[in-house]
């Protein structure tokens, strides 16, 4: 039945964003406020956990922004990237399913800079597997729920 | 039944990427290794062939990159583009369903450049129709399976 | 049944694009020509109206372009943005579901500039709610049907 299909749409919780500019895993997401919601999947320890085998469409939208009032950037040449990774509890190694992003030159000539990444793809996921999001330059993330989010919905069963 | 729905997720086969900076059709894709998979659709001659009428969600993620160790770019002003096209066997002309990309200035001041494009949309596809991917600057494509891929999954029947 | 699921894919009608560089709501879209289509949803007054409660995947692809033959840009520093908004008839306020875009420096050193945005996400929509698209710099929109479009398809019922 259509209403039993698992899904999740998780929005960034910006109260706990790491300070470095290196690639980090984002562990704080909302699952039950505003646009965020989850059904027949689990959110735990910063990971979206699959409870039901199937083929899922996965997506992520990540927005970065900088305003001159936030201070001077340590470097004007930035790699703004997202990696959607899958981890299997049985085999504790993670694999990148999707990546996207851009190198950017955010010069001091402009008072405001913005950039968004969107990735999406169709993947076979097994119960117990975990989806997580890694980004570079996390302190540049846009904390709005319409800006930085990821999600999944089940499309079909595995044969 | 959910498990009968056609789908494909095809990842770039970088062993056979054309050189040049012009627009080319990408014909080498994996369909059965790593994240690549196909069911109730066919991959042949560089095209994804529809076997079952329906409305499908189509998507593509295309990543371009350049490192200074690869040599100097012929021009620093680039058009990095993707075109998702549909060809009908009955009417041998192709039509662009979706396009995306950006003009970029990849200056020698930075040793590494990266840029990703994502497009997606919902289309009516008939059995026998073929989906293919065209890009500009194919020699700049990122060959990773998480970077450059396209796919489709059937959402519903045609009334 | 699969064939009863609502969907829409609307492509830009460029005969009526507002001028200016501010954020505007785009009200002219095709729903029944070329790739544009609609079923069990309604298009009215520039808004896509939900007729059936459910969880929908929403997406938008927005392309901007400028050629020097179009004249000089008023500013070379641009904010090229899209906002996918939801309005409820009961509560006449609009909320942004998704946003994306980039600040761009489109210098006169290049004769042609192009940039595309893609956003997508999974949202609960109720009958009577309306989806609309706002963009900045509408006069820079690419009017092709493969370039500037948005859509939705129902994935599952609400529990």
């Amino acid at each position: 039945k259509l209403e039993a299909q698992p899904f999740a749409h998780l929005t960034i919780n910006a109260t706990d964003i790491p300070s470095g500019s290196h690639k980090v895993s984002l562990s704080s997401w909302y699952h039950d406020r505003g646009w965020a919601k989850i059904s027949n999947m689990t959110f735990s320890n910063g990971k979206l956990i699959v409870n039901q085998d199937g083929f899922y469409y996965l997506y992520a939208n990540i927005c970065f922004r900088h305003h001159e009032t936030s201070g001077d950037l340590a470097t004007e040449y930035l790699q703004l990237m997202v990696y959607v990774t899958k981890t299997s509890i049985k085999i504790p190694s993670s694999h990148t399913l999707m990546k996207g992003g851009s190198t950017k030159y955010w010069s001091g000539n402009s008072e405001f800079h913005f950039y968004s990444i969107n990735v999406g793809g169709f993947f076979k996921l097994r119960s117990g597997e975990e989806i997580s999001i890694e980004v570079s330059n996390p302190s540049l993330l846009d904390p709005d729920q319409d800006a930085t989010y990821f999600g999944a919905f089940k499309v079909r069963d595995i044969d | 039944k959910l498990e009968a729905q056609p789908f494909a997720h095809l990842t770039i086969n970088a062993t056979d990427i054309p050189s040049g900076s012009h627009k080319v059709s990408l014909s080498s894709w994996y369909h059965d290794r790593g994240w690549a998979k196909i069911s109730n659709m066919t991959f042949s001659n560089g095209k994804l062939i529809v076997n079952q009428d329906g409305f499908y969600y189509l998507y593509a993620n295309i990543c371009f990159r350049h490192h200074e160790t690869s040599g100097d770019l012929a021009t620093e002003y680039l058009q990095l583009m993707v075109y998702v096209t549909k060809t009908s066997i009955k009417i041998p002309s192709s039509h662009t369903l979706m396009k995306g990309g950006s003009t970029k200035y990849w200056s020698g001041n930075s040793e590494f450049h990266f840029y990703s494009i994502n497009v997606g949309g919902f289309f009516k596809l008939r059995s026998g129709e073929e989906i293919s991917i065209e890009v500009s600057n194919p020699s700049l494509l990122d060959p990773d399976q998480d970077a450059t891929y396209f796919g489709a999954f059937k959402v519903r029947d045609i009334d | 049944k699969l064939e009863a699921q609502p969907f829409a894919h609307l492509t830009i009608n460029a005969t009526d694009i507002p001028s200016g560089s501010h954020k505007v709501s785009l009200s002219s879209w095709y729903h029944d020509r070329g790739w544009a289509k609609i079923s069990n949803m309604t298009f009215s007054n520039g808004k896509l109206i939900v007729n059936q409660d459910g969880f929908y995947y929403l997406y938008a692809n927005i392309c901007f372009r400028h050629h020097e033959t179009s004249g000089d840009l008023a500013t070379e520093y641009l904010q090229l943005m899209v906002y996918v908004t939801k309005t409820s008839i009961k509560i006449p306020s609009s909320h942004t579901l998704m946003k994306g875009g980039s600040t761009k420096y489109w210098s006169g050193n290049s004769e042609f500039h192009f940039y595309s945005i893609n956003v997508g996400g999974f949202f609960k929509l109720r009958s009577g709610e309306e989806i609309s698209i706002e963009v900045s710099n509408p006069s820079l929109l690419d009017p092709d049907q493969d370039a500037t479009y948005f859509g939705a398809f129902k994935v599952r019922d609400i529990d």
Epitope: G20, S21, H22, V24, S70, G71, A74, E76, N137, S139 | - | -
Partner: antibody, heavy 122, light 107 residues
């Protein structure tokens, strides 16, 4: 735990050179800017130089410009300060320090090395 | 370069006292000011960043305020471990400078 371990100090004659090292552990070194700060005997703190997380941006105090060079090797998690044309006024305890924010300047220095003494004397 | 002037240079106080140290910048630095504590023979320790943000692990009796050119560090109730030298440090346009320091000693 997060720490910075310094080495390379000593006594050097005026006009000569010296290289200081700072080995980082317990955090992602490649994600943060790094500073050198010095303190002359009985005096206050004196900022010397900084390098961005990726090594692309370097800034120096006027007093050391053209004489000192900051560098880093992210593969070795190590920060360096190459000092040349040293004079008695460069005598100080030298500290390496991690920038609190990797992306932005201005947030302060949250982790400091133990300090290494440089004495310039004939 | 921007000059930072701390006052007082020396401060005598007792355990439990409320102590305030002032730092003035020669021109506006917005909120780009940090405060450090240093004990003899030890490296400095970050207390406050961005004028008023408390560094993780620092006791809440420490607080910072101010913006533009005038800043203060307050210790609400001085503890035995707080006797040390305190430095302010500004950042402005790729230049960092420290104040001359304030020594807090036992009365």
């Amino acid at each position: 735990q997060v720490q910075l371990v310094q080495s390379g100090g000593g006594v050097v004659q005026p006009g000569r050179s010296l290289r200081l090292s700072c080995a980082a552990s317990g955090f992602t070194f490649s994600g943060y800017g790094m500073h050198w700060v010095r303190q002359a005997p009985g005096k206050g703190l004196d900022w010397v130089t900084v390098i961005s997380y990726d090594g692309s941006n370097k800034h120096y105090a006027d007093s050391v410009k053209g004489r000192f060079t900051i560098s880093r090797d992210n593969s070795k998690n190590t920060l360096y300060l190459q000092m040349s044309s040293l004079g008695p006024e460069d005598t100080a305890v030298y500290y390496c320090a991690k920038s609190l924010s990797g992306t932005y300047w201005g947030y302060g220095m949250d982790v400091w090395g133990q300090g290494t003494t440089v004495t310039v004397s004939s | 370069d921007i000059q930072m002037t701390q006052s007082p240079s020396t401060l005598s106080a007792s355990v439990g006292d409320r102590v305030t140290i002032t730092c003035r910048a020669s021109q506006s630095i917005s909120s780009w000011l940090a405060w450090y504590q240093q004990k003899p023979g030890k490296a400095p320790k970050l207390l406050i960043y961005k004028a008023s943000s408390l560094e993780s692990g620092v006791p809440s009796r420490f607080s910072g305020s101010g913006s533009g050119t005038e800043f203060t560090l307050t210790v609400s109730s001085l503890q035995p471990d707080d006797f040390a030298t305190y430095y302010c440090q500004q950042y402005n346009r790729y230049s960092w400078t420290f104040g001359q320091g304030t020594k807090v000693e036992i009365k």
